[in-house]
Each structure stands twice: as structure tokens, then as C-alpha cells.
């Protein structure tokens, strides 16, 4: 039931571009005056185990233009992709490179989007049509969830439940790593 990443059929992948495009300057923005004193969503720690870093999830970046009908973004946006399986953190860094992947003997754990962020985009349209302003939904972070036997996206279960979210200041918006996402990694996504 949840939003599926990459539902937008028309995307152009540009792996060589790595930085987030700067959003247009915000107008009359008095956001800072209106912040919740401890505003924001705290980090999601899905694993309430002895060692939070015991399991890990691969986050890839790639850059593309976004489209809305015949209109295309003036600048590309950098997207985060949650890739493949979840496994012990110590195995993950080399796992893809060696073509190996850690698989749990029990239930299947999947790396899926956790938080989302908005990015303002201006869309340029053909035929003299007025430009459009939109806010695109991008993945901000990934998490591991357990697939139930139905293997249905709506049946993904959290590794652990999260307590009531205190309003602690957090910005989940990730800064871009210099991301040259290679195609093999992209094919592993989701």
C-alpha cells in the first residue's frame, strides 16, 4: 500500500552527476522563526538489538531528471535508492563487489525506504506552456524490514517497533555523497 519508489515511468538516469541541485531560493521564508523548539523526526533505529549497527542496508545515489507529462525538471535531482537485502554490517561493504550476498537462513529481510524528503523542482514545458513548480518526493533514508510469508509490500514488518517519537531536532535530509552509482548496483535496488 505504501508509496513505491520510481513509479514515475519517465526518468533519465545520469549516474555521473553527484551533487543535489540547489533548490530555488525560498520566498518570504520565516521558517526559522517558526521551528518547533525540538522539532523534527528523530533517527529511525529499527533494530532494538544489543548492537544497532549489527544489520545494515545499502543506500545508493543516482541522479536523474524528473518529468510530469511533457514537462521536465530544469535541473536533475539526486535520488537515494535502498538496495537489496539486509545483512550484518561487517559483510555489506564488500558483498556486492564480490558478487556474494549474505542471506539469513530464516525470514527474508529487505532494505526499503524509511523516511522521505521533499525537493522543490521547476518543470519546463514545451510549446510555450508556463513552467510548473512541484515538490518531488525523494527517499531520505532506508531501513530493514522483514518480509512475511506473503511477500507483499504492505506486509513488510519492522525489525522492531519504534516508541513515540519525541520532537528532537533532526534533519533527515541527507547530503549527497559523491555518488557514481553503477548500473549493476541499480539493478540490485529493491
Amino acid at each position: 500500500q505504501g508509496w513505491q519508489a520510481f513509479k514515475n515511468d519517465a526518468t533519465e538516469i545520469i549516474p555521473e552527476l553527484g551533487e543535489y541541485p540547489e533548490p530555488p531560493p525560498e520566498l518570504e521564508n520565516n521558517k526559522t522563526m517558526n521551528r518547533a523548539e525540538n522539532g523534527g523526526r528523530p533517527p529511525h533505529h529499527p533494530f532494538e538489538t544489543k548492537d544497532v549497527s549489527e544489520y545494515s542496508c545499502r543506500e545508493l545515489h543516482f541522479t536523474r531528471y524528473v518529468t510530469d507529462g511533457p514537462c521536465r525538471s530544469a535541473k536533475p535531482v539526486t535520488e537515494l535508492v535502498c538496495s537489496g537485502q539486509c545483512g550484518p554490517a561487517r559483510l555489506l561493504p564488500n558483498a556486492i563487489g564480490r558478487g556474494k550476498w549474505w542471506r539469513p537462513s530464516g525470514p527474508d529481510f529487505r532494505c526499503i525506504p524509511d523516511r522521505y524528503r521533499a525537493q522543490r523542482v521547476q518543470l519546463l514545458c514545451p510549446g510555450g506552456e508556463a513552467p510548473r513548480a512541484r515538490k518531488v518526493r525523494l527517499v531520505a533514508s532506508c531501513k530493514c524490514k522483514r518480509l512475511t510469508r506473503f511477500h507483499n509490500q504492505s506486509e513488510l514488518k519492522d525489525f522492531g517497533t519504534e516508541a513515540a517519537r519525541p520532537q528532537k531536532g533532526r534533519k533527515p535530509r541527507p547530503r549527497a555523497r559523491s555518488a557514481k552509482a553503477n548500473q549493476a548496483e541499480l539493478e540490485n535496488a529493491y
Epitope: 505504501g2 523534527g40 521533499a118
Partner: antibody, heavy 121, light 110 residues
């Protein structure tokens, strides 16, 4: 399809606090951007605050700064809006509203049924 | 804080056309204010008609359209129906802070 169900009507005395809940179904709360809007009897809509996904922070309207707190319990997919130091002019219907979790952010697409809060001595 | 202005009331005949406008005290309304339009009938929660200046929703009747006109956001109703009688609110985004207009009471004179 996102659905929002709010808690029932409340009657409060001036100076008290009220906490209104908004239960999300169809999606998880972390996929959505939740906002709160109120409407005094016979008056217009007034934005109180909400989660800004551009920088991951909750923003409150200046008018309510220091009196309102918006929180979320992601284990139950329930959002809360607490308003303190109530006065008679806070008597209103309080709505939660969220986006539709689509590819483009469209805020205020889905609305709760509203919670009437009456402040009276 | 910005003030968002709307006509307090407008009247249209069935089948007629009417345009509601939404202005900002800070200057011209642009696409970067992501104008929204809502319809509210007595005793009901509001419902979104238009997002991001001109983007209709699956439930928005084709007779409603959004645009920018002369430095304001505009909602045009072409071919008014009796069921369109309602209060209409616009909403502007000031970089994450939102402000509603005071609302326009639209009467469809039968």
C-alpha cells in the same frame, strides 16, 4: 488510500490543555507529512503547523508558537496535537490533514473528520 | 506574517462562469507559492480541488481550473452547478509556512 480518524469532542476549562489524536491507516505516518488546521465556529480555516519534508522539521504558525506541540507515535501511526493555556477563542474544530504519499508532494489531500474542542468555564 | 486575501462573497448563475482570486500581502503570487484551493460545505471537512497552481485531483470536477492571473492565484468555475455553492479557501506556501485566505462564499443563484 490514506484515511485519518480523529479523537472525539472535548470540553476544557480556560488555562487547561487539550491533546487531539489523528490515527493514520493505509500508509505509515513516516511516509506522510501531517498538518493541523483549525476552524472556529463560523470562521475560516487557520493553519497551525505541520511536518515540513523539505528539511525534516515540524513548523508551527507564529501565532501558536510556544502553545502548541505536534508529536507522532510511529508504533501506532498516530499523530497528536496538544494546545496549552486554552482560552475561549480556541473553541474550534481541529482537523488533521496529510498528503497522499504520491510521487509529487501534495499536502492537505486527506482530512480527518474534525474534533470539536470547546473551551468554557 | 503574510496576509492572504480573497473576495468575501461572489454570486454566479447556474451554467455561468466565475473566477475567485487569491492575493498575497507580500507581492505577486507565483508558482513558488504552490497555490491550493479547497471547497468546504457546511458541516463537512474541506476537500482539495487544486494543488500547485493548476493541478486537479481525481475527484475535482472538470469545470474547475486553477491558474495565475495578474499576480494572483485564480480558481475559475465554468458552468456552475447548484452543488458548487460552498465556501472556497485558497492556501499559499511561504517556504514551508502555510497561510489560508479568508475564504469566498460562492452562491449559485437558481
Amino acid at each position: 488510500e490514506v484515511q485519518l480518524v480523529q479523537s472525539g469532542a472535548e470540553v476544557k476549562k480556560p488555562g487547561a490543555s487539550v491533546k487531539v489524536s489523528c490515527k493514520v491507516s493505509g500508509y505509515t505516518l513516516t511516509e506522510l507529512s501531517m498538518h493541523w488546521v483549525r476552524q472556529a465556529p463560523g470562521k475560516g480555516l487557520e493553519w497551525m503547523g505541520g511536518f515540513d519534508p523539505e528539511d525534516g522539521e515540524t513548523i508551527y504558525a507564529q501565532k501558536f508558537q510556544g502553545r502548541v506541540t505536534m508529536t507522532e507515535d510511529t508504533s501506532t501511526d498516530t499523530a497528536y496535537m496538544e494546545l496549552s493555556s486554552l482560552r475561549s477563542e480556541d473553541t474550534a474544530v481541529y482537523y488533521c490533514a496529510t498528503d497522499s504519499a504520491g510521487y509529487w508532494y501534495k499536502f492537505f489531500q486527506h482530512w480527518g473528520q474534525g474534533t470539536l474542542v470547546t473551551v468554557s468555564s | 506574517q503574510a496576509v492572504v486575501t480573497q473576495e468575501p462573497s461572489l454570486t454566479v448563475s447556474p451554467g455561468g462562469t466565475v473566477t475567485l482570486t487569491c492575493g498575497s500581502s507580500t507581492g505577486a503570487v507565483t508558482i513558488d507559492h504552490y497555490p491550493y484551493w479547497f471547497q468546504q460545505k457546511p458541516g463537512q471537512a474541506p476537500r482539495t480541488l487544486i494543488s500547485d497552481t493548476d493541478d486537479k485531483h481525481s475527484w475535482t470536477p472538470a469545470r474547475f481550473s486553477g491558474s495565475l492571473l495578474g499576480g494572483k492565484a485564480a480558481l475559475t468555475l465554468s458552468g456552475a452547478q447548484p452543488e458548487d455553492e460552498a465556501e472556497y479557501y485558497c492556501l499559499l506556501d511561504y517556504g514551508g509556512t502555510f497561510v489560508f485566505g479568508g475564504g469566498t462564499k460562492l452562491t449559485v443563484l437558481g
